[in-house]
């Protein structure tokens, strides 16, 4: 009789995550009489996958039924087979006895496991950031295999080439993870940017998984205060306007000073969106002339999405003779913007004279 | 290590039926046929019957397949044979035994049971 | 069914001798190359212990003293040098379909 060969025709197998593997093996000899036994790896601590002889081995059924006659086919299929599974399998002969002795291994057929990247992830600053800054945004992907893949980054459709990406461990894994860092400029426009991470992965049949993270999130447009001064009414009274434009977010407070005393304080709720996802806001106020001997400087002091406070001053003109119907009044807009932070520009600094 | 362990000594009346048991252990019972050898008093082997446990797939042969008949319980890993319409010269000693290498032998055996049949 | 016919019937041998039983089947118990012929040695009030399988093969713990031979139709269990130990009746088997038993041989020493 010819000398036994353990043969496992298939060098390497590739099985979908929840699928099974079927791992291939055939004897040429029914002699001399003995079990199978499948193993991953190799040496002492080689890891038991299937003994024909005896055990359970819930996840593993052997290919051919071991009860037939000259059954000299022994291959077994996995079931259920995880990213764990990867490794290299051997199918390896044993001459019975007590106890049984290993005779002959097959070459080893290596498993590997196509796993899904799992839906990418982006997380955008802890803290919001103005236009003109730039932010990193994280995408991370887990559990794929094999390690190949493919990230990019879009911002409104165009991708971004300034970005930095990982993917781990360096070596061989059952499974990998990704994880990118894209750096992008913020506009005063993007409050309805998005940036959108994309991972192409072998898994995915060409159908890439995307994570998207707004840009909303992540920038904080301060506003420009403007003010406005409607004529002097019959009865003494000038209505002031602190007009708030283009801020973003909502979260706004407007405080009215005289003379530096508060007036009046407002929360801005529930406004009206602009095309560009900010918002205006314009408050007013009613001075009464004839309360005063001086001058009124009217100060509208904004504080927005917890920054410091930025102030818009504006005076009203008392005149120094008793009122009388047809006298004049003038306000004066003194152009002040008073900030903690020199990052905005106030554009209105001239002065505007109203006469009644 | 392989061991198949039978029931005790049965004395029967002739008619009756008998039914022995081969407990396995030590390998999976499943992966492996039994068959059922006797042999009566100073006689030689002859062989009755085998069954897959797996699948209870039986062969007989023809001599007893009227009479014997084979089962399994894979719970308690243990083979069956009975034999029924018992007469005198079915006294004998039954074996159970295991085919290790799916070739129709008789690697491993059990102690044997002696079934008597007598008036 | 394939008869098996075994020859002779008893044999009495010296120790350290060589002792042969002859095992004729009805026809061929050859299949795909292997010989589908089974020895067993039993010992009184034993139970029968597998000796060589298919036709030639020594199974595990058997001494090297014992060798199986043949082909087709006939076959030989041959002990090199008897031991009292030996002292057993021998039965062959075929499964070339369903297994029968040969009669079996008593072997004693001379």
């Known amino acids: 009789e010819e000398e036994l060969q353990v043969i496992q025709p298939e060098k390497s197998v590739s099985v979908a995550a929840g699928e099974s593997a079927t791992l291939n093996c055939t004897a040429t000899s029914l002699i001399p009489v003995g079990p199978i036994q499948w193993f991953r790896g190799v040496g002492p601590g080689r890891e038991l996958i299937y003994h024909q002889k005896e055990g359970h081995f819930p996840r593993v059924t052997p290919v051919s039924d071991p009860t037939k006659r000259n059954n000299m086919d022994f291959s077994i299929r996995i079931s259920n087979i995880t990213p764990a599974d990867a490794g290299t399998y051997y199918c390896v002969k044993f001459r019975k006895g007590s106890p049984d002795v290993e005779l002959k291994s097959g070459a080893g057929t290596e498993l590997s496991v196509r796993a899904k990247p799992s839906a990418p992830v982006v997380s955008g600053p802890a803290v919001r950031a103005t236009a003109e800054h730039t932010v990193s945004f994280t995408c991370e992907s887990h559990g794929f295999s094999p390690r190949d893949i493919t990230l990019k980054w879009f911002k409104n459709g165009n991708e971004l080439s300034d970005f930095q990406t990982n993917v781990d461990p360096a070596g061989k894994s059952v499974s990998y993870s990704i994880r990118s860092t894209a750096r992008v400029v913020l506009t005063r426009r993007d409050v309805h940017s998005q940036v959108i991470c994309e991972v192409a992965h072998v898994t995915l049949q060409g159908d890439p998984l995307r994570g998207t993270a707004n840009l909303s999130e992540a920038i904080r447009v301060p506003p420009f205060l403007e003010f406005t001064q409607q004529s002097m009414r019959a009865d003494n009274q000038v209505n002031v306007t602190c007009q708030v434009m283009k801020f973003y977010p909502q979260r706004l407070q407007l405080t009215w000073l005289e003379n530096g005393n508060v007036s009046r304080t407002e929360m801005a709720s529930a406004l009206p969106e602009n095309k560009d996802g900010t918002y205006n806001w314009t408050s007013w106020l009613l001075v009464n002339v004839s309360a005063h001997r001086d001058d009124v400087k009217l100060t509208c002091q904004v504080e927005h999405d917890g920054q410091p406070a930025v102030n818009k001053s504006f005076s009203v003109k008392v005149s120094a003779h008793p009122k009388e119907q047809g006298s004049n009044t003038a306000a004066e807009n003194t152009g002040t913007n008073e900030r903690g932070s020199s990052d905005y520009k106030d554009d209105d600094d001239k002065h505007h004279h109203h006469h009644h | 290590q392989v061991q198949l362990v039978q029931s005790g000594a049965e004395v029967k009346k002739p008619g009756a039926s008998v039914k022995v048991s081969c407990k396995a252990s030590?390998?999976?019972?499943?992966?492996?046929?039994i068959n059922w050898v006797r042999q009566a008093p100073g006689q030689g082997l002859e062989w009755i019957a085998m069954?897959?446990?797996?699948?209870?797939?039986?062969h007989y042969n023809q001599i007893f397949k009227d009479r014997a008949t084979l089962t399994t319980d894979t719970s308690t890993s243990t083979a069956y044979m009975e034999l029924r319409s018992l007469r005198s010269d079915d006294t004998a000693v039954y074996y159970c035994?295991?085919?290790?290498?799916?070739?129709?032998?008789?690697?491993?055996w059990g102690r044997g049971t002696l079934v008597t049949v007598s008036s | 069914d394939i008869v098996l016919t075994q020859s002779p019937d008893s044999l009495a041998v010296s120790l350290g001798e060589r002792a042969t039983i002859n095992c004729r089947a009805s026809k061929s118990v050859s299949s795909s190359g292997y010989n589908y012929i089974f020895w067993y040695q039993q010992k009184p009030g034993q139970p029968p212990k597998l000796l060589i399988y298919l036709a030639s093969n020594l199974d595990s713990g058997v001494p090297d003293r014992f060798s199986g031979s043949g082909s087709g139709t006939d076959f030989t269990l041959t002990i090199s040098s008897l031991q009292a130990e030996d002292v057993a009746v021998y039965y062959c088997?075929?499964?070339?379909?369903?297994?029968?038993f040969g009669q079996g041989t008593k072997l004693e020493i001379k």
């Open positions: 030590g390998y999976t019972f499943t992966n492996y046929w």
């Open positions: 069954i897959d446990p797996s699948d209870s797939e039986t």
């Open positions: 035994a295991m085919d290790y290498g799916s070739l129709y032998a008789m690697d491993y």
């Open positions: 088997q075929h499964s070339r379909d369903l297994p029968t």
